[in-house]
Interface confidence: medium
């Protein structure tokens, strides 16, 4: 189920695009293997922009959170709402856009790294372990701050990008979050769009490096949604 996802507080306060969908919108890449979106299949497109009903933040896109559309509205009717930018009011981390977190009711930049080593991250495995099947289960994992005295090298476990050495960012990769290289020109990237995919981001890529942006590969314009590739290209 989609309840078995990374705790939104742990993932949405990361630098972009780490709170984001790792696959290309509309492709199976954005969902956990074998896990379907609620009320739809994992190949659904994201071109329909109607409000997306939700029960939890995890069911919303990278730049959204789940809440009642009206203040003090019916708690039973919740939809995915646009995330709050820096200095906007918030009640929890998930309300703030990627790269920010909620501090004293205001969205502030997570670059300040106030709570290094203090976050208890909920890593929920959606791939059955030795005692279960694909139904998934929840498990609390506290990553000790002792692990982060030295900057993480490529492939080492991390909580956030500041745990990683220069040129690396902290991104989820299948079972854990690890330090991955910031993307170079021509490398495959993930295009984040409004109303992003509503699934478990089981893989994440770093963002494109300085002077680059993530755009659709020229020869893939005709490709179907599920196979189209985006690459880092010069502005």
């Amino acid at each position: 189920t989609l309840n078995s996802v990374l705790n939104s507080n742990a993932i949405k306060n990361l630098p972009p695009p780490l709170g984001g969908a790792a696959g290309h919108p509309g492709s199976a890449v954005s969902a956990a293997p074998g896990i379907l979106y609620p009320g739809g299949n994992k190949y659904q497109t994201i071109d329909n922009y109607q409000p997306y009903p939700c029960a939890e933040d995890e069911e919303c896109g990278t730049d959204e959170y789940c809440a009642s559309p009206t203040r003090g509205g019916d708690a039973g009717v919740q939809i995915c709402l646009a995330c709050r930018k820096r200095r906007k009011r918030c009640m929890r981390h998930a309300m703030c856009c990627p790269g920010n977190y909620c501090k004293n009711g205001i969205c502030v930049s997570s670059d300040q790294n106030h709570f290094r080593g203090e976050i208890e991250e909920t890593i929920t495995e959606s791939f059955g372990n030795d005692h279960s099947t694909l139904d998934g289960y929840s498990r609390r994992t506290t990553l000790s701050s002792k692990m982060y005295h030295t900057k993480g090298q490529e492939g080492s476990v991390c909580l956030r990008s500041s745990d990683c050495a220069s040129g690396l960012c902290c991104a989820r990769h299948f079972w854990s979050k690890i330090c991955k290289p910031v993307l170079k020109e021509g490398q495959v990237c993930t295009k984040h769009r409004r109303k992003g995919s509503h699934g478990l981001e089981i893989f994440q890529r770093c963002y494109c490096g300085e002077g680059l942006s993530c755009r659709i590969q020229k020869d893939h314009h005709q490709a179907s949604n599920s196979s189209r590739l985006h690459t880092c290209q010069r502005h």
Epitope: G34, M147, Q153, G155, S156, V157, W175, Q187, L229
Partner: antibody
């Protein structure tokens, strides 16, 4: 530099047991997920199992072909990964590689041969 | 069971370019833009050459490149050299019980 050295392979009869070890050095072992991948003689690679970076209560995953028979474990204080193999079958005959699961299998050991035969 | 299909062998002359294909389904390679390629010389351990479709780990020659379209991924080796002669395996992630899938391998012969 990163080094992974497997040991514990050998000849065992069907139904028997064997415990493989993988000694890791050159990196912070406790910060990485670790996997076992095997390769039957003259055949391709087959993923066997993976364990998370924590040593106590670490989440583990297994390929369907070995689930219930093999157990992966690790001792971070000794920088060592283990694979306990029970109820061995002829089809388990292979070179078993220990691999660091960073960005995919980014470092491999040289492998240890397990032969299951009567 | 081999989940990803590769040609059993390919060959090329020094200096030439060759491409090795790897075909899967929408449940594995086609559904995830996360394809890796490994090189394995006889009697040696595999070595990661490409990850995330077209990313090279540090230390891997830029003669090696990866791409993907639909359910098929490709590894291209340009300026073929004698030391490139080896077996090459593709790897992807998959839905279902098998989380990691490999191709059957392709033997590259440098003529």
């Amino acid at each position: 530099q990163v080094q992974l050295v497997e040991s514990g392979g050998g000849l065992v009869q069907p139904g028997g047991s064997l415990r493989l070890s993988c000694a890791a050095s050159g990196f912070t072992f406790s910060s990485y997920w670790m996997s076992w991948v095997r390769q039957a003689p003259g055949k391709g690679l087959e993923w066997v199992s993976v364990i998370e970076h924590k040593d106590k209560g670490g989440t583990t995953y297994y390929a369907a072909s070995v689930k219930g028979r093999f157990t992966i474990s690790r001792d971070n204080s000794k920088n060592t990964l283990y694979l306990q193999m029970n109820s061995l079958r002829a089809e388990d005959t292979a070179v078993y590689y220990c691999a660091r699961h960073g960005i995919d299998f980014d470092h491999w050991g040289q492998g240890t041969l397990v032969t299951v035969s009567s | 069971d081999i989940a990803l299909t590769q040609p059993a062998s390919v060959s090329g002359s020094p200096g030439q370019s060759i491409t090795i294909s790897c075909t899967g389904t929408s449940s594995d390679l086609g559904g995830y833009n996360y394809v890796s390629w490994y090189q394995q010389h006889p009697g040696k351990a595999p070595k990661l050459m490409i990850y995330d479709v077209n990313n090279r780990p540090s230390g891997v020659s830029n003669r090696f490149s990866g791409s993907k379209s639909g359910n098929t991924a490709s590894l291209t080796i340009s300026g073929l050299q004698a030391e490139d002669e080896a077996d090459y395996y593709c790897q992807s992630y998959a839905s279902g019980n098998t989380k990691v899938v490999f191709g059957g391998g392709t033997k590259l012969t440098v003529l």
